[in-house]
């Protein structure tokens, strides 16, 4: 969490941002909140990006003002106009690109004063893994697949029964470049699995960590997966 205060002028207002990560090809949110004002027409929101000459987005006098918007953001940004009055200056970003990564500044002016806060935005690709029993294999084998990751992640297998065991000798992981030539499909195969055990396939890069679990018994197979973004710090 980054909290910024205005330093110029007589008054300062608190502006709060949260570091976040964007999944390339999907929409992202750059979070920013501020002390609200009673009049929408008195609020100015400016989003800036370090190293970019034009503005990312500007909202003032109750409407978007995009005449100074940088070319890389045209048609790709929007504030939640109906929520500005309650102090939400968050920015929606369409079709996140790798090049959107960087340091952003949320700069606010209201009748109470000015304030700003920076936000670190990481971009990459992350997706939920799915673990299945590979019935085509000669021995009992598990196959963990996740369709989109970038940068290249690490894959680690773990088991509930053999806690702390190293499965690197009995697993094989491959990375296949997807058609857009950036993200990769992750496939990891675990051999010689035993029934009545829960196995976890953990995929991690510097942006996200995802886990796919599978519990194999004689009577049923249970699956579960979850994904967690790393380094979500508020400012």
């Amino acid at each position: 969490l980054i909290i910024g205060f205005g330093i110029s002028g007589r008054h300062s207002i608190t502006v709060t941002t949260v570091a976040s990560a964007g999944n390339i090809g999907e929409d992202g949110i750059l979070s920013c909140t501020f002390e609200p004002d009673i009049k929408l027409s008195d609020i100015v929101i400016q989003w800036l990006k370090e190293g970019v000459i034009g503005l990312v987005h500007e909202f003032k006098e109750g409407k978007d003002e995009l005449s100074e918007q940088d070319e890389m953001f045209r048609g790709r940004t929007a504030v939640f106009a109906d929520q500005v009055i309650v102090g939400n200056a968050s920015l929606r970003l369409k079709n996140v690109q790798l090049t959107d990564a960087g340091t952003y500044k949320c700069y606010i002016i209201t009748s109470k004063g000015k304030g700003n806060a920076n936000l670190e935005y990481k971009t990459g690709a992350f997706s939920m893994p799915e673990v299945n029993v590979d019935y085509n294999a000669s021995s009992e084998t598990l196959r963990c697949e996740a369709p989109r990751w970038f940068p290249q992640p690490t894959v680690v297998w773990a088991s509930q029964v053999d806690q702390g065991a190293n499965f690197s000798e009995v697993s094989n992981t491959s990375f296949e470049l997807n058609s857009e030539n950036v993200t990769m499909k992750v496939v990891s195969v675990l051999y010689n699995v035993t029934i009545n055990n829960t196995y976890s396939c953990m995929i991690e890069n510097d942006i996200a960590k995802a886990t796919g679990d599978i519990k194999v018994t004689e009577s049923e197979i249970k699956r579960r997966s979850h994904l967690q973004l790393l380094n979500s710090k508020a400012s």
Epitope: G25, G54, K63, E65, E68, Q69, R74, A78, K94, N95
Partner: antibody, heavy 119, light 107 residues
Framework: QIQLQQSGPGLVQPSQSLSITCTVS????????VQWIRQSPGKGLEWLGV???????DYNAAFLSRLSFSKDNSKSQVFFQMNSLQADDSAIYYC?????????????WGQGTLVTVSA | NIVMTQSPKSMSMSVGERVTLSCKAS??????VSWYQQKPEQSPKLLIY???NRYTGVPDRFTGSGSATDFTLTISSVQVEDLADYHC?????????FGSGTKLEIK
């Protein structure tokens, strides 16, 4: 009330240029981009390009060498020009405004300019 | 270019019936699909944007759904005034593209 009013010729000679003016009201050209779309019986709706609030443009690559957009923010006017028209450019040409600045759909359309390319 | 394929090409329905129109994208377009109604000699009118958001003033019998590649426009109880062509379009990536349309006729 948001409106887009188009003006331009109906008949264009082959190999000549087409110019259309789209005059907008109810919103500012510094807040929203203006899209250009055409519709012909053979090809349906076809996106031609957009002029953004900043004045920068994006064109459909299929028409890149023939298209040019400009605008006058103070007069709330957007100008469309297409060169070297041929018979298959006969269509209804529309200007339109996005529903949001993030371009999720075209909420407001001009009345259209019916263009016939014929000698 | 992303190809938007609409089906059926045309359909004839009775008043009060439920109508389902389909639009499929050749690549993932997130939720950047919009639906338009066009009556003869008129400009297209926006019905749905962002795949599922009903535009201001559009009757609630019109519903949009879907994401990624498969999208649907549903008219829960078709009315005589719904006689029109319906177009879907994607605004996810350049060039923006449209489907070839579905003509809805009323029996």
């Amino acid at each position: 009330q948001i409106q887009l009013q188009q003006s331009g010729p109906g008949l264009v000679q082959p190999s000549q240029s087409l110019s259309i003016t789209c005059t907008v009201s109810g919103f500012s050209l510094t807040s929203y981009g203006v899209q250009w779309i055409r519709q012909s019986p053979g090809k349906g709706l076809e996106w031609l390009g957009v002029i953004w609030s900043s004045g920068s443009t994006d064109y459909n690559a299929a028409f890149l060498s023939r298209l040019s957009f400009s605008k006058d923010n103070s007069k709330s006017q957007v100008f469309f020009q297409m060169n070297s028209l041929q018979a298959d450019d006969s269509a209804i040409y529309y200007c339109a405004r996005d529903v949001t600045t993030i371009v999720e759909g075209f909420a407001h359309w001009g009345q259209g300019t019916l263009v016939t390319v014929s000698a | 270019n992303i190809v938007m394929t609409q089906s059926p090409k045309s359909m004839s329905m009775s008043v009060g019936e439920r109508v389902t129109l389909s639009c499929k994208a050749s690549e993932k377009v997130g939720t950047y699909v919009s639906w338009y109604q066009q009556k003869p000699e008129q400009s297209p009118k926006l019905l749905i944007y962002g795949a599922s958001n009903r535009y201001t003033g559009v009757p609630d019998r019109f519903t949009g759904s879907g994401s990624a590649t498969d999208f649907t426009l549903t008219i829960s109880s078709v009315q005589v005034e719904d006689l029109a062509d319906y177009h879907c379009g994607q605004t996810y990536s350049y060039p923006f593209t449209f489907g070839s349309g579905t003509k809805l006729e009323i029996k």
